[in-house]
């Protein structure tokens, strides 16, 4: 199957400078997220400028098929991949000037999913077997959000709406969205 990623120009998303993210919903066992409970860098703002409009977050359009075993959606679905680190728009890839990638020294602002949309998808199976329709949740927009000591790098891929985020530690499967043929393309995703 051809898993395709289509890049658009960077979309400017204003970071929520004063906001500390709520920990995502978790199960009782608190193992949903790989939290750094101790340590972490002090929570100070990494940005020198006071003009928050200078900071951007890239939204990549990602088109894929929904699959369940041998069954595949009749049509591909398109969602967004929230890509890379939030930084000055002038230094983002695709921005005018093609400047060097900017990385703050303090706590990260990250480009993460903001809103989701649900879509019902009809699957088709080989041999004419009739599968049921499925509902998928697709990223509809992204935002810059400040990461505090509660979040570490490995958690970036787990920002999302699910209550019972599955545990994926037993197999070395890539975690990033679009982790098929375009894995390198989306190296910075989430």
């Amino acid at each position: 199957q051809g898993w395709q990623a289509f890049k658009n120009d960077a979309t400017e998303i204003i970071p929520e400078l004063g906001e500390y993210p709520e920990p995502p919903p978790e199960l009782e066992n608190n193992k949903t997220m790989n939290r750094a409970e101790n340590g972490g860098r002090p929570p100070h703002h990494p940005f020198e400028t006071k003009d928050v409009s200078e900071y951007s977050c890239r939204e990549l359009h990602f088109t894929r098929y929904v699959t369940d075993g041998q069954c595949r959606s009749a049509k591909p679905v398109t969602e967004l991949v929230c890509s890379g680190q939030c930084g000055p728009a002038r230094l983002l890839p695709n921005a005018i000037g093609r400047g060097k990638w900017w990385r703050p020294s303090g706590p990260d602002f990250r480009c993460i999913p903001d809103r989701y949309r649900a879509q019902r998808v009809q699957l088709l199976c080989p041999g004419g077997a009739a599968p049921r329709a499925r509902k998928v949740r697709l990223v509809a927009s992204c935002k810059c959000k400040r990461l505090t000591r509660f979040h570490n790098q490995s958690e970036l891929k787990d920002f999302g709406p699910e209550a019972a985020r599955p545990q994926k530690g037993r197999k070395p499967r890539p975690r990033a969205r679009g982790a098929k043929a375009n894995q390198a393309e989306l190296e910075n995703a989430y």
């Epitope: 041998q70 019902r120 209550a163």
Partner: antibody, heavy 124, light 106 residues
């Protein structure tokens, strides 16, 4: 906390009607399929049907088709299971469950959130 | 309708022993999901998509299989593992559960 909260236990007489509820907390039920599962005393789990609260589309297991009605009110994030005329054989525990979804290069679905169950007792 | 048959119906084992539960489908399914239910509680997800461990579930639980034959394995039973286990298929309507396997203390 993401959860499904079901209405309380019911004791009814044969022939009476009943509507039990399942309310989504900290998520919108319209974004997921909500399922109803029956468990008769000392027995296993039986899938009754599902609803897409976004548009009210339902599917039923053949044995429950015409016996119960599944509905939802997405504005209050609540799904319902109702009977127009109860029988003694409807005595059971009824669970609602959310069909969760996850994508990491593969698509995954599973019943990730369950209600606490509603006990329905039908006895003359 | 895809019928899921679980065997054995009851498994009597001691803590520390290995438990192997089977689920056989009447026709091929993409994946099987496993749930654990304790008395007076709602079921809880253990294994999804045949072999993926759900959040917070200990690594002593594992799943395998394909097509029509699937297995849930508990490598070393802990006291809290004594419960009823159900397999489920979500691929085709009507959705179906297996009849359950009760794992009891020997």
């Amino acid at each position: 906390e993401v959860q499904l909260v079901q209405s309380g236990a019911e004791v009814k007489k044969p022939g009476e009607s009943l509507k039990i509820s399942c309310k989504g907390s900290d998520f919108e039920i319209k974004d997921y399929y909500i399922h109803w599962v029956r468990q008769m005393p000392g027995k296993g789990l039986e899938w009754m049907g599902q609803i897409d609260a976004e548009d009210g589309e339902t599917e039923y297991a053949p044995r429950f088709q015409g016996q119960v009605t599944i509905s939802a009110d997405k504005s209050i994030s609540t799904a319902y299971l109702q009977w127009s005329s109860l029988k003694a054989s409807d005595t059971a525990m009824y669970y609602c469950a959310r069909e969760g979804y996850y994508y990491d290069g593969r698509d995954y679905w599973y019943f990730d959130v369950w209600g606490q169950g509603t006990t329905v007792t039908v006895s003359s | 309708e895809i019928v899921l048959t679980q065997s054995p119906a009851t498994l009597s084992l001691s803590p520390g022993e290995r438990a192997t539960l089977s689920c056989s489908a009447s026709s091929s399914v993409s994946y099987i999901h496993w749930y654990q239910q304790k008395p007076g509680q709602a079921p809880r997800l253990l294994i999804y998509s045949t072999s993926e461990l759900a959040s917070g579930i200990p690594a002593r639980f594992s799943g395998s299989g394909s097509g029509t034959d699937f297995t849930l394995t508990i490598s070393s039973l802990e006291p809290e593992d004594f419960a009823v286990y159900y397999c489920q298929q979500l691929s085709h309507l009507p959705l179906t559960f297996g009849g359950g396997t009760k794992v009891e203390i020997k």
